[in-house]
Interface confidence: low
């Protein structure tokens, strides 16, 4: 069946979404290079705005096969940069310790629950 | 067929503002960054800067960026640097040229000659 | 600034010879996140833009002749022509995009003897 307005903002579409196309640099046409594009600077921008990582969590991006791993391994990025806490010049305040996962410097709340916490209570 | 096609040579009195425009087809315009490179006679090749048709995002070589402004205009695929204030060191041959995300150059225009001249 | 060191600055072969030209750079252009040389080399013939000829160091552009070859890792590369033919008069040079500012090697004017 059709999917409904709805269903694009529920966390699996929402996560489908992000892993095929967030940082995807291997795209078979140049309509999925736009949607690439476009996936990856409003998840860019989301993360860095609302303090939040991935759709869930930071796990989703060690849970699940993405073309954000493909492109980047595990230990050099265990997560995207925009997870890092920031200073005021929009720069990972300790990346080091972002990476290690070493709380206070990366965001462990996912971004699903801060888009759709004021859509559901509507 | 993947085309940059730029505007044609221009002769520009010294302080005179010049813009140039590169015109893109055969390709989805907001999906490749467009970049600026000047070369002069033997003096090789030099990167002014890009720009993200899809938003405007802009990087510059520290050295252009009180030189050059980079703006596109979507309706038209047409991507346009400014050169302000030009002097005779601003003479030379420049090139647009596209690359997907932070890829190599694929594609380049034929290329612009600005001679500046009083 | 990444710099980029290019050698040598002009050569003189005859046709059918083998034609080596490298490129240093002062940093290393590896990407350890996915392994790939953030190299390429260009070909630019005289009233002409330059065209694509080698990416990811040693990657050949669809549509250049295989005697084109790139080679190298980190921060020595080479762009060897097999077999060198009279359309192969141009200048050389190498790009890396590794980092901010993009820098070009100075160049590699190939002509023949």
């Known amino acids: 069946t059709a999917a409904t307005q709805q269903d694009f903002f529920t966390p699996n579409l929402f996560l489908k979404q992000m892993l095929e196309r967030y940082q995807n640099n291997s795209p078979p046409n140049n309509d999925d290079q736009w949607k690439n594009n476009g996936v990856t600077k409003t998840w860019d921008r989301l993360m860095l705005q609302d303090n939040c990582c991935g759709v869930n969590g930071p796990s989703d991006w060690q849970k699940y096969t993405s073309a954000f791993r493909t492109e980047n391994n595990d230990a050099d990025y265990p997560w995207p940069r925009q997870c890092c806490v920031m200073n005021n010049l929009k720069e990972p305040l300790n990346l080091e310790a972002c990476k290690l996962g070493v709380p206070g410097f990366y965001h462990n709340q996912g971004c699903y629950e801060l888009i759709s916490g004021p859509m559901n209570r509507h | 067929q993947v085309l940059l096609q730029q505007s044609g040579p221009q002769l520009v009195r010294p302080g005179a503002s010049v813009k140039i425009s590169c015109k893109a087809s055969?390709?989805?315009?907001?999906?490749?960054?467009i970049h600026w490179v000047k070369q002069r006679p033997g003096q090789g090749l030099e990167w002014i800067g890009m720009?993200?048709?899809?938003?405007?995002?802009?990087s510059f070589n520290q050295k252009f960026k009180d030189k050059a402004t980079l703006t596109v205009d979507k309706s038209s695929s047409t991507a346009y640097m400014q050169l302000s204030s030009p002097t005779s060191e601003d003479s030379a041959v420049y090139y647009c040229a596209r690359s997907y995300y932070a890829s190599r150059f694929d594609y380049w225009g034929q290329g612009a000659t600005l001679t500046v001249s009083s | 600034d990444i710099v980029m060191t290019q050698s040598p600055s002009s050569l003189a072969m005859s046709v059918g010879q083998k034609v080596t030209m490298n490129c240093k750079s002062s940093?290393?252009?590896?990407?350890?996140?996915?392994?790939?040389?953030?190299l390429a080399w260009y070909q630019q013939k005289p009233g002409q833009s330059p065209k694509l000829l080698v990416y990811f160091a040693s990657t050949r552009e669809s549509g250049v002749p295989d005697r084109f070859i790139g080679s190298g890792s980190g921060t020595d590369f080479t762009l060897t022509i097999t077999s060198v033919q009279a359309e192969d008069l141009a200048d050389y040079f190498c790009l890396q995009h590794y980092g901010t500012p993009l820098t070009f090697g100075a160049g590699t004017k190939l002509e023949l003897k």
């Open positions: 940093q290393s252009l590896l990407n350890s996140n996915n392994q790939k040389n953030y």
């Open positions: 720009i993200d048709p899809s938003d405007s995002e802009t």
């Open positions: 055969g390709y989805s315009f907001t999906s490749y960054w």
